[in-house]
């Protein structure tokens, strides 16, 4: 590895009311040739490690979550490896993780608080 | 290329604490990565300890929770383990390792006795 | 928390012959969520699969890791000398991540 991916998301929770959308954001640089098919994206549930949402081998795995989850996937190749939870309930709130490797790995967890 | 080194006693008496420091090197232990203990009893396999983000979120293993304590000091790129009221069955190689979800890279591993 | 058993606990084989080690998961978890090790006597760990099938960087490519659900497997499919270590597998998908008990590949 050349050096940890650096992952970046908001410090301050994502606040949102019941039944509406949130989106979590989450972002990495990405290095000059970089191609979708050498991300892993892992969407995880902070304290337990569920998983919510993944991509790999150049293909978004879906979610596992409920399927109330989306990735952005016009976006992934800019970096951006936010999260959309969708028909937010009370029970979802708390901390996700968002792992990304390429050739070396990164991660950082972002708080969802539910109005 | 980020590199990491145990330190600390290799003798610890029961009913003690084994003190452990992992110096992070060719990085910084700021980056986006949670930093982690793993230990290996004589012979045996490995078990996860737990772990520090660079905000000091930790996550424990739930068998060791109420023993261990990690903290994380960035002025010196290092973090720390704390493990109370030691037994022999703590007896191990006592590993530092980067990583959220697996492991990579890990330190060369520091041995602790447990012993009068 | 997920147990992993491994199998078979040795496995003896010579120079040049394929290996297959096998590692079961407790529950059924994503591929994604599991890795495997390399662990050579007096070393650390070395991170050699993750994702279930994905080498880590400057693996050789006779490693290949690959599975789903409760069942995976690493395959080494010409042994070379310095291919003679113990083998973990790990999953990250249920907190606390937890280990195998390990497959030592030894020499016939």
């Known amino acids: 590895p050349t050096g940890a991916v650096e992952v970046q998301v908001p410090e301050d929770p994502v606040v949102a009311l019941v039944g509406t959308d949130a989106t979590l954001r989450c972002s990495f640089s990405p290095e000059p040739g970089f191609s979708l098919a050498q991300l892993n994206l892992i969407w995880q549930l902070t304290d337990t490690k569920q998983l919510v949402h993944s991509f790999t081998e150049g293909r978004d795995q879906g979610s596992a979550y409920a399927n109330r989850t989306a990735l952005f996937p016009d976006l992934l190749a800019q970096g951006n490896a936010s999260l959309r939870l969708q028909r937010v309930r009370v029970a979802d709130e708390g901390s996700f993780t968002c792992f990304v490797s390429i050739r070396d790995f990164g991660s950082a967890a972002v708080s969802l608080q539910v109005a | 290329q980020v590199q990491l080194q145990e330190s600390g006693p290799g003798l610890v008496k029961p009913s003690g604490t084994l003190s452990l420091t992992c110096a992070v090197s060719g990085g910084s232990i700021s980056t986006s990565n949670w930093w982690n203990w793993v230990r290996q009893s004589p012979g045996k396999g490995l078990e996860w300890i737990g772990e520090?983000?660079?905000?000091?979120?930790?996550n424990y293993s739930p068998s060791l929770k109420s023993r261990v304590t990690i903290s994380i000091d960035k002025s010196k790129n290092q973090f720390s383990l704390k493990l109370n009221s030691v037994t022999a069955a703590d007896t191990a190689v006592y590993y530092c390792?980067?990583?959220?979800?697996?492991?990579?890279?890990w330190g060369q591993g520091t041995l602790v006795t447990v012993s009068s | 928390e997920i147990v992993l058993t491994q199998s078979p606990g040795t496995l003896s084989l010579s120079p040049g012959e394929r290996a297959t080690l096998s590692c079961r998961t407790s529950q059924s978890i994503n591929g994604i969520l599991l890795a495997w090790y390399q662990q050579k006597p007096g070393q650390a760990p070395r991170l050699l699969i993750y994702g279930a099938s994905s080498r880590a960087t400057g693996i050789p490519d006779r490693f290949s890791g690959s599975g789903s659900g409760t069942d995976f497997t690493l395959s080494i499919s010409r042994l070379e000398p310095e291919d003679f270590a113990v083998y973990y597998c790990?999953?990250?998908?249920?907190?606390?991540?937890?280990f195998g008990q390990g497959t030592k590949v030894e020499i016939k």
């Open positions: 390792a980067r990583g959220w979800n697996y492991f990579d890279p």
């Open positions: 520090i983000y660079p905000t000091g979120n930790t």
């Open positions: 790990q999953q990250y998908g249920s907190s606390p991540r937890t």
